[in-house]
Interface confidence: medium
């Protein structure tokens, strides 16, 4: 028999036995020769892979493209189709061989002790029990149990065929748990293997591939694809795979049922496709189809196979990232690579670890970027197989909108004496530096609230019309100095100063700074008073627990009703761009204070004393005086800052040192604290006394030992003490060399 389509100018392989069916007895030798016009191969029953030890395929001695298949001592199990075919074509010749073995008329299953037949309870469906025969003309019946029933061929819907098996309507055996075929030869009964009967449904819920996507491997690695089908109960599943390289040597398919929870209304089936060592030709689409006979569902995934491990940065990898303070910054590490690389981020060479402010992974995320985050970030990718490394530098530039330093430092409501020259300053910090700083002004009375008006903290000044300082008509004569650049607190800042030649009118001044990412402004209330004057006794900046007096002095002939107030805390903070409220127009925010009045020949002096000043005493103090004639109120404001008490600390360390006799030692000990600490020096725990060779300078900060002698060797201690305690540092001075003898000796 011949199969396949005839190819152009290629005849079918020719078999030495010119029959469709050959019947031979058991224990004899089967030998068939196949001749053709190109390379040939044989396929035989029960072993499609060609590794069966009993089967011998040899080249013919008398010709090219000729192969002989020999099986000595055949058995019933050798019954089946023998196919000779051209390699890589469908052209083949087939002969069906019956090995008559009366001891085992049924061909045994290759691997199982029993078989399984799946049936559906459908009146029109037939089922084939595959009890094939090694003898073609047997009398075969089918036994089903339990209860026991026997079915014999009826020449219609029940039949037996040695090449196919026993065919019967499925509903007739759906009650049975198992079936088997039975043959009678010379009054002897022979049974086939048992077949378990499984009644099946057909509905497939879904077919899932795992991994479902993004499968990448390199040549030589193992590919494992799991295909899971979920079905209704009583379903049998047949899996079918489609993949790029179907002739793969190392392919392995394993199908099995998965356990489901008892009482579950569902079954699970798993088919696992394994390719031990993938090649480039295995790259492509893998499709798993699950079929229940009446229904088929499929799913696909793409498998990418790389020639070798590699790592590289993707084209979208940034080199410069710009951000504004406060923003969230995300810098993704865009890479191509297999397997996925290990990713490590560095800032200015220091490894970055993830914490609540920064996440260093595939994406470097800075939650709220600040100025100190500016710098060069290096990302290093390491391929975990080849260990190849690739690095890329990303520069992060953090922009800062203009910030005006004095805003937080100086009271928004200071008063200025009439006729004086005053300098107003705006110190601007911005990245990039501001491209301009402009000054504007307005008369105070044009902006001030009338006493009858309700005060709005968010908008205390109703005025909107700011005038450029070039137009000082009706105001104070002004000169704007050229911007200067200064390094303040380690930052480059732009300082803009406005000089008021003579303080004649009360006004508001505004400086506005603009850069590429924003603007900042500061409003200065320039309240000019001919009225009282405030001075602080004894010190401009007292420390907590010290006493301080605020003196308000006014000309007795002009002013009366001197009163001290403290400016209460604002109900809301003044936000950027808001204006301070004129104090005298709004006494609701003032607290009246107790004070003592003194007089001299011309002035009244109202003294408000703060004993044991505390940090809570900080704030704006207002002295109010009333004009005797006009009854107009005049206010002067002074901001009081109370310095916090700080225990002594010594900055820097004293270093141990070795000096030769006759040389000099100079060391310094810088201490800080409030109140300022006293510095004392000790040698070997005894107070160091100044003499011709030991000099203490700058409040004992600097110690010089001139022309050192052997006896100067020892432990030197610098101790800084105040009422809040002491701090000390120590160093050992070693003096080397022999002492020169003096003339006195």
């Amino acid at each position: 028999a011949s199969v396949g389509l005839p190819s152009v100018s290629l005849d079918l392989p020719r078999l030495s036995i010119q029959k469709d069916i050959l019947t031979i007895k058991a224990n004899t030798t089967l030998q068939i020769t196949c001749r053709g016009q190109r390379d040939l191969d044989w396929l035989w029953p029960n072993n499609q892979s060609g590794s069966e030890q009993r089967v011998e395929v040899t080249e013919c001695s008398d010709g090219l493209f000729c192969k002989t298949l020999t099986i000595p001592k055949v058995i019933g199990n050798d019954t089946g189709a023998y196919k000779c075919f051209y390699r890589e074509t469908d052209l083949a010749s087939v002969i069906y061989v019956y090995v008559q073995d009366y001891r085992s008329p049924f061909i045994a299953s290759v691997s199982d002790q029993h078989g399984v037949v799946y049936i559906t309870e459908n009146k029109n469906k037939t089922v084939v029990i595959p009890c094939l025969g090694s003898i073609s003309n047997l009398n075969v019946s089918l036994c089903a149990r339990y209860p026991e029933k026997r079915f014999v061929p009826d020449g219609n819907r029940i039949s037996w065929d040695s090449k196919k098996g026993f065919t019967i309507p499925s509903y007739m055996i759906s009650y049975a748990g198992m079936v088997f075929c039975e043959a009678k030869i010379n009054d002897e009964s022979y049974q086939s293997i048992m077949y378990i009967v499984v009644v099946v449904g057909y509905r497939i819920y879904d077919v899932v591939l795992s991994p479902s996507h993004g499968i990448e491997l390199s040549v030589g690695e193992k590919l494992v694809l799991n295909c899971t089908a979920r079905t209704e109960l009583n379903v049998g599943i047949d899996f079918n795979w489609e993949y790029p390289s179907s002739k793969h040597q190392h392919k392995k398919l394993v199908n099995r049922d998965l356990k489901t929870q008892s009482g579950s209304e569902m079954k699970k089936f798993l088919s696992t496709l394994t390719i031990d060592g993938v090649t480039r030709s295995d790259q492509g689409l893998y499709t798993c189809a699950a079929s229940s006979g009446l229904m088929t569902k499929k799913n696909s995934t793409f498998v990418r196979v790389h020639e070798k491990p590699f790592v590289a940065f993707g084209s979208g990898m940034e080199s410069l990232v710009e951000a504004t303070v406060g923003e969230r910054v995300r810098i993704p590490a865009k890479y191509l690579g297999y397997p996925p690389p290990e990713i490590k981020w560095y800032k200015n060479g220091i490894p970055l670890e993830s914490n609540h402010t920064i996440k260093a992974g595939h994406v470097l995320t800075i939650m709220e970027v600040s100025e100190r985050d500016t710098g060069n970030y290096t990302v290093i990718l390491t391929n975990p197989i080849s260990k190849e490394k690739q690095s890329h530098v990303v520069s992060l530039v953090v922009y800062v909108p203009p910030q005006i330093g004095e805003k937080s430092l100086i009271s928004p409501v200071d008063s200025y004496q009439y006729g004086t020259t005053q300098t107003l300053t705006c110190t601007v910090y911005a990245i990039p530096p501001p491209h301009h700083i402009h000054w504007y002004w307005q008369l105070e009375e044009e902006c001030a609230n009338e006493p009858s008006q309700a005060v709005s903290v968010t908008n205390p000044y109703p005025c909107e019309e700011w005038r450029s300082v070039e137009d000082f008509q009706g105001g104070n004569k002004i000169e704007v100095n050229k911007n200067q650049f200064a390094l303040i607190e380690g930052k480059n800042k732009t300082v803009s100063t406005l000089v008021i030649q003579a303080a004649n009118v009360s006004a508001l001044y505004k400086c506005e700074a603009v850069n590429k990412v924003g603007r900042g402004e500061r409003v200065i209330s320039f309240h000019v008073t001919r009225g009282p004057e405030i001075t602080l006794q004894p010190d401009m900046q007292p420390t907590e627990q010290e006493s301080v007096s605020l003196w308000c002095t006014a000309d007795r002939s002009t002013f009366e009703n001197l009163t001290w107030y403290k400016l209460g805390p604002q109900p809301l903070p003044i936000h950027v761009g808001e204006l301070p409220t004129p104090v005298c127009k709004n006494l609701d925010t003032l607290w009246k204070l107790n004070a003592t009045m003194f007089s001299n020949s011309t002035n009244d002096i109202l003294i408000m004393e703060l004993k044991n000043a505390s940090l809570q005493d900080q704030g704006d103090y207002v002295c109010l005086a009333q004009d005797r004639k006009t009854k107009k109120r005049h206010c002067v404001v002074r901001q009081l800052t109370v310095l916090e008490r700080v225990a002594p600390t010594i900055t820097g360390n004293l270093e141990n040192q070795t000096t030769s006799i006759g040389e000099s030692i100079e060391v310094s000990c810088t201490a800080s604290g409030n109140p300022p600490p006293q510095i004392m020096w000790f040698k070997d725990n005894e107070t160091l006394v100044e003499d011709s060779g030991i000099v203490l300078k700058d409040g004992n900060r600097n110690l010089t030992i001139r022309r050192v002698r052997k006896e100067d060797e020892g432990l030197y201690t610098c101790q800084a003490c105040s009422v809040l305690g002491c701090a000390k540092v120590e160093a050992f001075f070693i003096i080397e060399g022999a002492q020169e003898k003096t003339n006195l000796e």
């Epitope: 390199s218 070798k308 491990p309 390491t382 975990p384 260990k387 190849e388």
Partner: antibody, heavy 122, light 107 residues
Framework: SLEESGGDLVKPGASLTLTCTAS?????????MCWVRQAPGKGPEWIAC????????PSYASWAKGRFTISKASSTTVTLQMTSLTAADTATYFC????????????????WGPGTLVTVSS | DVVMTQTPFSVSAAVGGTVTINCQAS??????LAWYQQKPGQPPKLLIY???NLASGVPSRFKGSGSGTEYTLTISDLECADATTYYC?????????FGGGTEVVVK
């Protein structure tokens, strides 16, 4: 070839620095230099590796982080600094070379030194 | 760190026979696995790298196989000189972990 030195008998709590000197080749991006130790009668235990190229951090076994520091002292020497040593650190310390290729898998640790013995005992 | 479980602890066979040593990784290490032979008083000697590649100078009696998490070293035609300890080692990524070792006894 590779040769380890610096092994000694030290007291618990002490520190010690071991040196591995390469001959016939110098460190480059083709190599990782590694330290391994082997306690008497036990199997080898990886400590740390450092990349021969110019980029990247050393890698450490989780138990070795903090007490052990690997570094390249020159293009032919790699050191292992060990602190707070205990009796459990008694072992022969080996230096080994892992050969790696650009876009090609590593080829294992093909070159080892003979080892240097560190004994921690009071 | 990846845990490498090597079995059996000890295996014996006659001269000319075959022994098989297994090594299991706690997670996939692709094929980044080496096998070493160590004789007393000597450093380990590389036999196999990348699971199945023979290191230079190693006889073809030594055969490595496996990928993912399961690996095997097979020594055939055993000689007396093969009686010693064998270790597997993962070198995937920045983790390098050894198995516990298998002693081969040749009778």
């Amino acid at each position: 070839s590779l040769e380890e030195s610096g092994g000694d008998l030290v007291k618990p709590g002490a520190s010690l620095t071991l040196t591995c000197t390469a001959s016939g080749f110098s460190f480059s991006s083709n190599y990782y230099m590694c330290w391994v130790r082997q306690a008497p009668g036990k199997g080898p235990e990886w400590i740390a590796c450092i990349y021969g190229g110019s980029i990247g951090d050393p890698s450490y076994a989780s138990w070795a982080k903090g007490r052990f520091t690997i570094s390249k002292a020159s293009s032919t020497t790699v050191t292992l600094q060990m602190t707070s040593l205990t009796a459990a650190d008694t072992a022969t310390y080996f230096c080994a070379r892992e050969e790696v290729g650009v876009s090609a898998p590593s080829r294992g640790w093909g070159l080892w030194g003979p080892g240097t013995l560190v004994t921690v005992s009071s | 760190d990846v845990v490498m479980t090597q079995t059996p602890f000890s295996v014996s066979a006659a001269v000319g026979g075959t022994v098989t040593i297994n090594c299991q990784a706690s997670e996939s290490i692709y094929i980044n696995l080496a096998w070493y032979q160590q004789k007393p008083g000597q450093p380990p000697k590389l036999l196999i790298y990348d699971a199945s590649n023979l290191a230079s100078g190693v006889p073809s009696r030594f055969k490595g196989s496996g990928s993912g998490t399961e690996y095997t070293l097979t020594i055939s035609d055993l000689e007396c000189a093969d009686a010693t300890t064998y270790y597997c080692q993962n070198y995937y990524g920045s983790s390098y972990d050894f198995g516990g070792g298998t002693e081969v006894v040749v009778k």
